[in-house]
Interface confidence: low
């Protein structure tokens, strides 16, 4: 399951609540073609990796979170553990997304 993040507080709360678990954040936008393309894959990964927390941030609805996380382009994937960013990349690269999850989980 992918959790939609609606505010900065909700974002920080989700990171905090994750404990030791890996958190994967998808920063996307409704007008972004590559974001739409990778979205089903991102959701399928959330089913496959049940021990990982998957979050989705719409950069237009949540500009403060996107700004705080210094998101410059979409899609951007950021990875957090224990509240710390442990990885990041931009682009709709399915292989890299799953490889990074496997590397960090």
């Amino acid at each position: 399951m992918v959790k939609q993040i609606e505010s900065k507080t909700a974002f920080q709360e989700a990171l905090d609540a994750a404990g030791d678990k890996l958190v994967v954040v998808d920063f996307s936008a409704t007008w972004c073609g590559p974001c739409k393309m990778i979205k089903p894959f991102f959701h399928s990964l959330s089913e496959k990796y049940s021990n990982v927390i998957f979050l989705e941030v719409d950069v237009d609805d949540c500009q403060d979170v996107a700004s705080e996380c210094e998101v410059k382009c979409m899609p951007t994937f950021q990875f957090f553990k224990k509240g710390q960013k442990v990885g990041e990349f931009s682009g709709a690269n399915k292989e890299k997304l799953e490889a990074t999850i496997n590397e960090l989980v």
């Epitope: 900065k8 553990k81 710390q84």
Partner: antibody, heavy 116, light 105 residues
Framework: EVQLQQSGAELVKPGASVKLSCTAS????????MHWVKQRPEQGLEWIGR????????KYDPKFQGKATITADTSSNTAYLQLSSLTSEDTAVYYC??????????WGQGTSVTVS | QIVLTQSPAIMSASPGEKVTMTCSAS?????MYWYQQKPGTSPKRWIY???KLASGVPARFSGSGSGTSYSLTISTMEAEDAATYYC????????FGAGTKLELK
């Protein structure tokens, strides 16, 4: 412009309590976490804890559990730090801080507490 | 809790000299933060995400490291760099190092 304005210096007696305030401007404290940091004279920085003002959830360094109580009032956009059963070890400057992940951090000017 | 050990505790450098200070973590961390503090002032974020310079920080500063070993380097010391530098990690329970006091020789 983001600013954190802290209350003035305190001189308190051993065994007493003190409540420090930190009023934010330029942002809504409900949208973030507010942290408190202690710095004893000529010493380093110690993280005390933080609050999520949106729901009142707090987290403390175990060392400060029972000593410090962090609260917030969203109507006045203010976070508070209460210190109880004060001793000379509590003589320090206390900072409120907005510690963000990658964006700029913001710190208050500090409040000096002297226990004497 | 992660303990951060900074060395040296105090050091002095002449203008133009290269300066390196280190911060060792008791457990692996993913990113290190560094703060600069001058007497009577609040700490200032100096370096974040291990190697990114905060806004307004001169390019002579750099940060590096991974795992448990991190460092802050000044390529050519200037008088205004004299200050105390603290390393900081952002796990579930944030901690700071004891600081390195950099004096002008």
């Amino acid at each position: 412009e983001v600013q954190l304005q802290q209350s003035g210096a305190e001189l308190v007696k051993p065994g007493a309590s003190v409540k420090l305030s930190c009023t934010a401007s330029g942002f809504n404290i409900k949208d973030t976490f507010m942290h408190w940091v202690k710095q004893r004279p000529e010493q380093g920085l110690e993280w005390i804890g933080r609050i999520d003002p949106a729901n009142g959830n707090t987290k403390y360094d175990p060392k400060f559990q029972g000593k410090a109580t962090i609260t917030a009032d969203t109507s006045s956009n203010t976070a508070y730090l209460q210190l109880s059963s004060l001793t000379s070890e509590d003589t320090a400057v206390y900072y409120c801080a907005l510690l963000q992940y990658s964006a700029m951090d913001y710190w208050g000017q500090g409040t000096s507490v002297t226990v004497s | 809790q992660i303990v951060l050990t900074q060395s040296p505790a105090i050091m002095s450098a002449s203008p133009g000299e290269k300066v390196t200070m280190t911060c060792s973590a008791s457990s692996r961390i993913s990113y290190m933060y560094w703060y600069q503090q001058k007497p009577g002032t609040s700490p200032k974020r100096w370096i974040y995400d291990t190697s990114k310079l905060a806004s307004g920080v001169p390019a002579r500063f750099s940060g590096s490291g991974s795992g448990t070993s991190y460092s802050l380097t000044i390529s050519t010391m200037e008088a205004e760099d004299a200050a105390t530098y603290y390393c900081h990690q952002r796990s579930s329970y944030p901690t700071f190092g004891a600081g390195t006091k950099l004096e002008l020789k």
